[in-house]
């Protein structure tokens, strides 16, 4: 069976949009206008993964792209990049460990855990035009709440 | 070797708590997910619900509200404790752990306690 | 949640027969389903995953197949110790759900 997908928009809780900074990097910016289609579109998968009454296992890859959100050790720390992928072979419902996200719903925020690492989270600064980042911290000065737009097909 | 056992009282009275423990050796409870599955005298399996090895849990929606799973990882034990407890709730009992092989195999049970009795009378 | 149509819910045979045992899921579950053994008082035991795959240590005469919503599970020559009752399980998403049983009784 086909992975289940929906494509979606994520905005942090200060309404920054995320796009590509080069071609494997996303930032965070406050867009508007016609500037605004300039956002990632994600593909965001329902997929196998330690789900949990709080948590839906889910993968992020860009739409139409063979790119997806995923986690790695990089100096020996957690570190967000896209992945480059077999597009024959993606999504699947099988997704490997370090492209999965426990999506957190909270007071209609969604927090995107780690799979790989617990308690890290997709992150944004609270400047402007900063990488997209994993982080350890939650309630800090770094962001970790989103929302989600759906975007038809 | 893997081996799972369960523990607890055979004999809780209406409206109670059922209370057991899952005693398990040869895996780490930090990195395997566990599962309770329940079984009425003569009946089918049901599977209850399940605590990952990072401390998450799933509870299958019928029982959700009177369960809850927790477990210690130093002492290698996963309790289940199911509140409320009526006659519909005899069964013999069964921990098992997940498979947990990432994008390949997440949610089969390889290995299974061999079971323990709880009856619910007065 | 996923419902998983077990049948026959009991079966009779004789030593050396040929057992059939089929599953069906009310969606497509990929390849993930698992069939189990269970003697009386005993825990229920794995034996094949992922549709077809045989665990370790099982003997070849148990053999799965299928994919999508159908499976069949087959003894292909029923030996005395295979008498018990066998419960396929859907481990495509949760909650996890089992077929009804189907108790092999010997004939």
């Known amino acids: 069976a086909p992975v289940r997908s929906l494509n979606c928009t994520l905005r942090d809780s200060q309404q920054k949009s995320l796009v590509m900074s080069g071609p494997y990097e996303l930032k965070a910016l406050h867009l508007q206008g016609q500037d605004m289609e300039q956002q990632v579109v994600f593909s965001m998968s329902f997929v196998q993964g330690e789900e949990s009454n709080d948590k839906i296992p889910v993968a992020l890859g860009l739409k139409e792209k063979n790119l997806y959100l995923s986690c790695v050790l990089k100096d020996d720390k957690p570190t967000l990049q896209l992945e480059s992928v077999d597009p024959k072979n993606y999504p699947k419902k099988k997704m490997e460990k370090r492209f999965v996200f426990n999506k957190i719903e909270i007071n209609n925020k969604l927090e995107f855990e780690s799979a790989q690492f617990p308690n890290w989270y997709i992150s944004t600064s609270q400047a402007e035009n900063m990488p997209v980042f994993l982080g350890g911290t939650k309630g800090g000065q770094d962001i970790t709440d989103f929302t989600m737009q759906f975007v038809s097909s | 070797e893997v081996q799972l056992q369960e523990s607890g009282p055979g004999l809780v009275k209406p409206s109670e708590t059922l209370s057991l423990t899952c005693t398990v050796s040869?895996?780490?409870?930090?990195?395997?997910?566990v599962s309770w599955i329940r079984q009425p005298p003569g009946k089918g399996l049901e599977w209850i619900g399940l605590?990952?090895?990072?401390?998450?849990?799933y509870y299958n929606s019928p029982l959700k509200s009177r369960l809850t799973i927790s477990k210690d990882n130093s002492k290698s034990q996963v309790s289940l404790k199911l509140s409320s407890v009526t006659a519909a709730d005899t069964a013999v009992y069964y921990c098992?752990?997940?498979?947990?092989?990432?994008?390949?195999?997440?949610?089969?049970?390889?290995?299974w306690g061999q079971g323990t009795l709880v009856t619910v009378s007065s | 949640d996923i419902q998983m149509t077990q049948s026959p819910s009991s079966l009779s045979a004789s030593v050396g027969d040929r057992v059939t045992i089929t599953c069906q899921a009310s969606?497509?579950?990929?390849?993930?389903l698992n069939w189990y053994q269970q003697k009386p008082g005993k825990a229920p035991k794995l034996l094949i995953s992922?549709?077809?795959t045989l665990r370790p240590g099982v003997p070849s005469r148990f053999s799965g197949s299928g994919s999508g919503t159908d499976f069949t599970f087959t003894i292909s020559s029923l030996q005395p110790e295979d008498f018990a009752t066998y419960y396929c399980?859907?481990?495509?998403?949760?909650?996890?759900?089992f077929g009804q049983g189907t108790k092999l009784e010997i004939k």
């Open positions: 098992a752990r997940q498979t947990n092989l990432w994008a390949y195999d997440l949610y089969s049970m390889d290995y």
């Open positions: 040869g895996f780490s409870l930090s990195d395997y997910g």
């Open positions: 605590i990952w090895g990072g401390g998450d849990t």
């Open positions: 969606t497509d579950i990929d390849d993930d």
């Open positions: 992922l549709g077809s």
């Open positions: 399980l859907q481990s495509d998403r949760l909650p996890l759900t």
